[in-house]
């Protein structure tokens, strides 16, 4: 730089008051947002910034100082006496790391030709400033028509009157962007064609849109396009314990900002989203899929004592289907049903209750009915199988009454009302019913089916029978009714309390018609189908114990 | 070092001239303006104008124009302070001093040692 | 034209105090203002530019401040080389000095 002597810069010492409004001012100015990223600041060069003034009498470094006696690097030119001033100040080689688009900042005062006494002539109000690429750190060139021209600066507030106003200088900040670059780095170079200028801070910069965790994705430092109006599209990477399925991507502007974004990460399943990270479930907390939002507690009647539960374990004796989602509360299976009444008529058994008192913790409570018929001699029950029909059903059923139609007559009848839910076939434990016994009152028994032959002779048929499938009662006596072949009108009636009988009086080598039907107290049954049998010849042998078909 | 010679004292009569010399050294002449400060005995300074260096084109404060002519020779590198019809009320010690221009402000920054002119019958 | 006005005319200090001078021009010369030291029969020296801004070698028990047309010039321990004649000027398109204050030894 120039000798200093005999020229107006702060000496290196004491709180300048000049100094110290530049240092406040420059201060309030001196962080860069978080997207700019800094080549060069002059502000922040301690040592001595290396730049050239050409000619040696133009620009100079003028030594202002900060309050902690730093040095400030101002340059100042106002050689506002000679004509055709054409004075540079080049820096040194700025590497652009990567940047293809430069920003320059510049700070200065520039001081309006009306403040100065007439007859000056020659004072301007602007400056000029170019910049040269080159790969070379050394290969700083004063030749100015290497240098290609950014723009003619001028002062947006060019203070007429040297305005410090209250003791806060005003700095004029201009900023110019330079691209696409090609090369590694660049020089800048300020020209002065007669202005009566300070140059007060120069920050070289480039944008960049910041790492940042947007919707659980990390997105990297991302330098930004050379094109004024181009976005690049940045993929974004999940954060620990995060997953996708749509994968996070973020436009980068041109100003160093994000924008557009698509898709997005979620907490892996036992994680939930705190402050832009995933953090554990707590024990006691569970979170069974990356869609949900946040660890939930435990449900009722479930436990995790560990942490990054999925789910969580149904307390002992409680249980959760497998189709049920985890949300759900653990169950048990219900307790009996209370107070079962049943009504009994000649075609039905009504049978009533309350539910149970412990429903297991579920809404879901349902009724089975278990039907067993019970003999009431050997005390053996089984089940009733597929004669008794159910109104509305058997299985599922809702509501606290069912009817059971088409009961067996004269029937020790024993009906369990079992509360199921939906886990009561996961439950080892034995099953919780109330019983109710009923026996059906007696009815008119079913037709007898099963006759056999005995002993036929030429004058008597010996015949033998099963009970009915249904008594529907206890049998007080059978009546027989037998007459010879095409001759119904003229019938004969037997009535017996055995099951067995023996027709006599008949005619040699004839056939008779038998139907048979059985009484209970509730009155005969229907006779039943028609059995022939034929007596023997005079001459011919008697024949027993053959079944008719 | 940067100094500004002027001549010894001058006494002269009144209606007389006077060519008050100011040699500059130490720096480029013509870089600086040359400004003129008068002081009469006993008083405070009066700011008289002052002439660039460069153009060689003057500035006269009020007052101080007519008889007063402030010129240059760069080629040695010297102002010049010319007074006309001297009057009695002329006699002062004449200042010459360097002009500064700043961003930051202006200043008289070196002055020469004056020269005394007397004007007396 | 610009006048401007220093009191007092004479300050009488002890080596040692502090001494505020002022100087209030007719209408704001923004902080267009220079003081400057003259001791007897010598040059005036210019002490402060700018309203407030040191010019070379001026020690920093001398400090200056105001802007528009209030201005003050103060040395905070008078040694006893700063007895002298004090002036302030304005400059702009015309220039014009106030009368002096004197700091004499009290």
């Known amino acids: 730089p120039a000798s200093l002597a005999g020229c107006y810069s702060a000496p290196l010492k004491g709180p300048l008051w000049t100094c110290l409004l530049l240092c406040a001012a420059l201060r309030t100015l001196l962080a860069s947002p978080s997207n700019e990223v800094n080549l060069l600041d002059s502000r922040t060069v301690l040592g001595d910034l290396g730049w050239i003034a050409f000619p040696k009498n133009g620009w100079e470094e003028i030594g202002e100082v900060d309050e902690n006696y730093a040095p400030i690097h101002t340059y100042q030119v106002c050689k506002v006496m000679e004509q055709n001033q054409n004075n540079w100040l080049l820096t040194s080689w700025i590497s652009n790391e990567g940047a293809s688009r430069i920003f320059i900042e510049l700070k200065f005062t520039l001081r309006d030709c009306n403040s100065l006494p007439g007859g000056l002539g020659t004072c301007k109000e602007t400056f000029n400033m170019y910049y040269f690429e080159s790969d070379d750190e050394n290969g700083r060139n004063i030749k100015d028509n290497q240098y290609i021209k950014i723009d003619t600066i001028a002062a947006d507030e060019s203070f007429t009157e040297l305005d410090l106003g209250d003791r806060v200088m005003k700095l004029n900040t201009e900023v110019r962007d330079v691209g696409p670059l090609s090369k590694k780095g660049f020089y800048l170079a300020f020209q002065d064609v007669g202005a009566c200028i300070a140059l007060v801070s120069v920050r070289v910069y480039y944008k960049k849109c910041p790492s940042v965790v947007r919707h659980l994705a990390v997105f990297p430092d991302t330098i930004t396009g050379a094109d004024s109006s181009q976005l690049l599209e940045v993929s974004g990477s999940c954060v620990n314990h995060s997953v996708t399925d749509d994968p996070p991507k973020m436009h980068c502007s041109a100003e160093g900002e994000w924008l557009v974004p698509i898709g997005k990460c979620m907490c892996k399943a036992g994680y939930e989203e705190k402050n832009g990270t995933c953090q554990v479930c707590r024990p006691g907390f569970f979170k069974a899929s990356p869609h949900s939002q946040t660890c939930s507690k435990c449900p009722p009647h479930s436990y995790t004592h560990e942490e990054a539960s999925t789910s969580c374990v149904c307390e002992k004796d409680y249980f959760r289907r497998e189709s049920d989602p985890p949300t759900m509360a653990c169950t048990r299976p219900p307790s009996a049903p209370r107070n079962a009444i049943s009504n009994v008529n000649e075609t039905s058994v009504f049978l009533e209750w309350i539910p149970p008192a412990d429903t297991g913790g579920g809404k879901d409570v349902s009724y089975y009915i278990l039907c067993k018929k019970c003999n009431s001699h050997a005390g053996v029950c089984e089940e009733c199988g597929g004669h008794v029909r159910y109104l509305p059903q058997q299985i599922g059923l809702k509501n606290t009454s069912v009817m059971m139609a088409d009961p067996l007559a004269h029937t020790n009848y024993t009906f369990e009302i079992e509360a199921v839910n939906g886990v009561s076939d996961l439950s080892p434990g034995t099953r919780q019913y109330v019983s109710v016994n009923v026996t059906t009152n007696q009815a008119a028994p079913s037709p007898v089916t099963n006759v056999k032959k005995g002993k036929i002779a030429k004058n008597s048929i010996s015949l033998s029978w099963q009970e009915p499938d249904r008594p529907n009662g206890i049998i007080l006596e059978y009546e027989i009714k037998y007459f010879e072949k095409d001759q119904e009108t003229s019938y004969t009636i037997i009535k017996s309390k055995e099951t067995t009988i023996t027709a006599e009086g008949l005619k040699p080598a004839s056939v008779y018609v038998f139907q048979i039907r059985a009484r209970t107290a509730a009155g005969y049954g229907v006779f039943s189908r028609r059995f022939e049998f034929e007596t023997t010849p005079v001459f011919g042998a008697s024949n027993d114990q053959s079944q008719i078909p | 070092q940067v100094q500004l010679l002027q001549s010894g004292a001058e006494v002269k009569k009144p209606g007389a001239s006077v060519k008050v010399p100011c040699k500059a050294s130490?720096?480029?002449?013509?870089?600086?303006?040359m400004s003129w400060v008068r002081q009469a005995p006993g008083q405070g300074l009066e700011w008289m104008g002052w002439?660039?260096?460069?153009?060689?084109?003057?500035t006269y404060a009020q007052g101080f124009t007519g008889r007063f002519v402030f010129s240059l020779d760069t080629s040695v590198s010297t102002a010049y302070l010319q007074i006309s019809s001297l009057k009695a009320e002329d006699t002062a010690v004449y200042y010459c001093?360097?002009?500064?221009?700043?961003?930051?402000?202006?200043?008289?920054?070196?002055w020469g040692q004056g020269t005394l002119v007397t004007v007396s019958s | 034209e610009i006048v401007l006005t220093q009191s007092p005319a004479t300050l009488s200090v002890s080596p040692g105090e502090r001494a505020t001078l002022s100087c209030r021009a007719s209408?704001?010369?923004?902080?267009?203002l220079a003081w400057y030291q003259q001791k007897p029969g010598q040059a005036p020296r210019l002490l402060i530019y700018?309203?407030?801004t040191w010019a070379t070698g001026i020690p920093d028990r001398f400090s200056a401040s105001g802007s528009g047309t209030d201005f003050t010039l103060t040395i905070s321990r008078v040694e006893p080389e700063d007895f002298a004649v004090y002036y302030c000027?304005?400059?702009?398109?015309?220039?014009?000095f106030g009368q002096g204050t004197k700091v004499e030894i009290k």
């Open positions: 001093a360097r002009v500064r221009f700043t961003v930051y402000g202006d200043g008289m920054d070196v």
């Open positions: 130490g720096y480029t002449f013509t870089s600086r303006a």
């Open positions: 002439i660039n260096t460069n153009t060689g084109n003057p």
């Open positions: 209408q704001s010369v923004s902080s267009n």
């Open positions: 700018g309203a407030s």
């Open positions: 000027q304005q400059y702009g398109p015309s220039w014009t």
